[in-house]
């Protein structure tokens, strides 16, 4: 989960630590500590909605809550792209939009969110249990993917609340880049604190956050591999696979989204922030690239409330996405 920067409140230094050396040894650790605490990780949210007018028509919206620049978005269904999922659309911020039936209209809504209308396969909606996944490749974070589906009993015209899915995957490029620096900083911080442990440390005031505010945590490979063992399997019913249609796809068009209640206290991300709610929707999934799924909101045992990242087994090149897109 992405967390808002929580800058620790510092008490004045104790007498006797006021010298130049004292200042230098104090400032650096607290800057590093702030970095470690505030190191928010990106987040992808997914919203799936069945249109009231056409019961077999779906609209998927996805957004990326992160500071990096998005290099590619891939929307798939039936599971993550490349793990049995079928690509519905690929959106590149500068190179354009590609989509395949039953996708009818893919578009950028903002610089960090996209929407996709799917045309249904019949009068009724056999696709209500289909899982839709959005993968955002970004720099420097790497690739992040979240999946969602309609809640089983959703009424037409209503949508599952956007799923602020903690994404259990990131490419090595992003992890080694950002997390490596942070990890090094945190280790260095501990080293400094140990060196100066004979000195009384400034007291930290506990930051006031709401009960559901997620805590930041530094990434460690051991945590990731441990968590991987505990991700439960879930069966995904992808019985609905409309026949492939050869259609031309118009772009652009009106925005059909009414404002939802805003739960953006910890997501100061501009236009897309309203679409992120801390309450996971029933039927929405968090995906893991190796084919495992965890129900959103159910945390793997022993991993705590923080985010656990899984490096992409394909290595740094995996963030390139569809071929030729660098």
């Amino acid at each position: 989960m992405r967390t808002e920067a929580q800058v620790p409140a510092l008490q004045p230094p104790e007498p006797g630590l006021e010298g130049a050396m004292g200042h230098r040894t104090l400032v650096l650790p607290w800057v590093l500590l702030t970095l470690c605490v505030t190191a928010g990780t990106p987040e992808v949210w997914v919203q799936v909605r069945m249109e009231a007018t056409e019961l077999s028509s779906f609209t998927i919206r996805c957004g990326f809550l992160g500071s990096g620049s998005i290099s590619l978005v891939t929307v798939s269904w039936g599971g993550p792209n490349g793990a049995g999922g079928t690509t519905l659309a690929v959106l590149h911020p500068e190179r354009g939009i590609r989509q395949w039936a039953p996708a009818r209209q893919a578009r950028w809504e903002t610089q960090s969110s996209i929407s996709l209308i799917l045309e249904g396969s019949g009068a009724s909606s056999p696709c209500a249990n289909t899982t839709f996944c959005c993968k955002f490749a970004s720099f420097p974070e790497g690739s992040w993917e979240a999946c969602g589906s309609l809640p089983p009993s959703s009424d037409p015209g209503l949508s599952a609340p956007p799923t602020p899915a903690p994404i259990l995957r990131a490419d090595l490029a992003g992890i080694l880049g950002v997390s490596g620096v942070l990890l090094f900083g945190c280790v260095y911080l501990l080293h400094l604190l140990r060196r100066h442990k004979h000195r009384p440390a400034p007291r930290l005031q506990p930051s006031r956050t709401s009960p559901q505010a997620p805590r930041a945590r530094a990434w460690a490979p051991s945590q990731a591999s441990q968590a991987a063992l505990h991700v439960p399997y879930a069966t995904i019913n992808t019985s609905c696979r409309p026949a492939t249609l050869d259609t031309a796809h118009p772009h652009g068009g009106p925005s059909w989204w009414a404002s939802l209640p805003t739960h953006a206290a910890h997501r100061p991300q501009g236009p897309a922030a309203w679409a992120s709610t801390p309450i996971p929707a029933r039927g929405s999934f968090v995906s893991v690239e190796n084919g495992l799924y965890a129900q959103a909101g159910e945390r793997p045992p022993h991993t705590g409330p923080g985010l656990t990242l899984f490096p992409d087994p394909r290595g740094p090149r995996a963030m390139e996405g569809p071929l030729g897109v660098r």
């Epitope: 079928t86 911020p93 118009p250 652009g252």
Partner: antibody, heavy 114, light 113 residues
Framework: EVQLQQSGPELVKPGASVKISCKAS????????INWVKQSHGKSLEWIGD????????NYNQKFKGKATLTVDKSSSTAYMELRSLTSEDSAIYYC???????WGQGTTLTVSS | DIVMTQSPSSLSVSAGEKVTMSCKSS????????????LAWYQQKPGQPPKLLIY???TRESGVPDRFTGSGSGTDFTLTISSVQAEDLAVYYC?????????FGSGTKLEIK
């Protein structure tokens, strides 16, 4: 290094069909979304269609519907374009290219002549 | 379909000169959601497949010399070669990357005097 290797030149008779191949290498094949482009002699480029490799979803330029059929074979990392009911108008160089046209095959020259 | 119109159809310049070619689209190629123009430029040398030079109207593909510059927005776009080299002899195409079907301009043939 990404490579798209196309099949060799074809000389066919009017009314016949031909199947051109484009073998992709250098990455996972399911990352290849293939476009097909026609270039008539000394003329501009025309987009024929594209294909998504996971389940073969396609888009066609209306002009080439009924003329071209795009398929993929994931096991051999190869995309195919079949052209049918050939006429002299179909004589051209046909290129395959990746999703955003940043890698191209070397082209397949098709000559339709009796 | 979006029609792409290029001008001039050909031009002849001496090495070292600056050259500008134009591309106009029948519909806007600006994506309102992210304010990006979906237009690409390609260079095709004799006997070779096209090569991507510019995408997003102004972003150079990696490995493309910085003498190639793309500009423009909406329906009017320009490709500029700041100092033409002998190896730039080619046909240059613009392409609608905005919506299906993807359409190309008729090309501008660059000849070196």
């Amino acid at each position: 290094e990404v490579q798209l290797q196309q099949s060799g030149p074809e000389l066919v008779k009017p009314g016949a069909s031909v199947k051109i191949s484009c073998k992709a290498s250098g990455n996972t094949f399911t990352d290849y979304y293939i476009n097909w482009v026609k270039q008539s002699h000394g003329k501009s480029l025309e987009w024929i269609g594209d294909i998504e490799p996971n389940n073969g979803g396609t888009n066609y330029n209306q002009k080439f519907k009924g003329k071209a059929t795009l398929t993929v074979d994931k096991s051999s990392s190869t995309a195919y374009m079949e052209l049918r009911s050939l006429t002299s108008e179909d004589s051209a160089i046909y290129y395959c290219a990746t999703l955003y046209f940043d890698y191209w095959g070397q082209g397949t020259t098709l000559t339709v002549s009796s | 379909d979006i029609v792409m119109t290029q001008s001039p159809s050909s031009l002849s310049v001496s090495a070292g000169e600056k050259v500008t070619m134009s591309c106009k689209s029948s519909q806007s190629l600006l994506n309102s959601g992210n304010q990006k123009n979906y237009l690409a430029w390609y260079q095709q040398k004799p006997g070779q497949p096209p090569k991507l030079l510019i995408y997003g109207a102004s972003t150079r593909e990696s490995g493309v010399p910085d003498r190639f510059t793309g500009s423009g927005s909406g329906t009017d776009f320009t490709l500029t070669i700041s100092s033409v080299q002998a190896e730039d002899l080619a046909v240059y195409y613009c392409q609608n990357d905005h919506s299906y079907p993807f359409t190309f301009g008729s090309g501008t043939k660059l000849e070196i005097k």
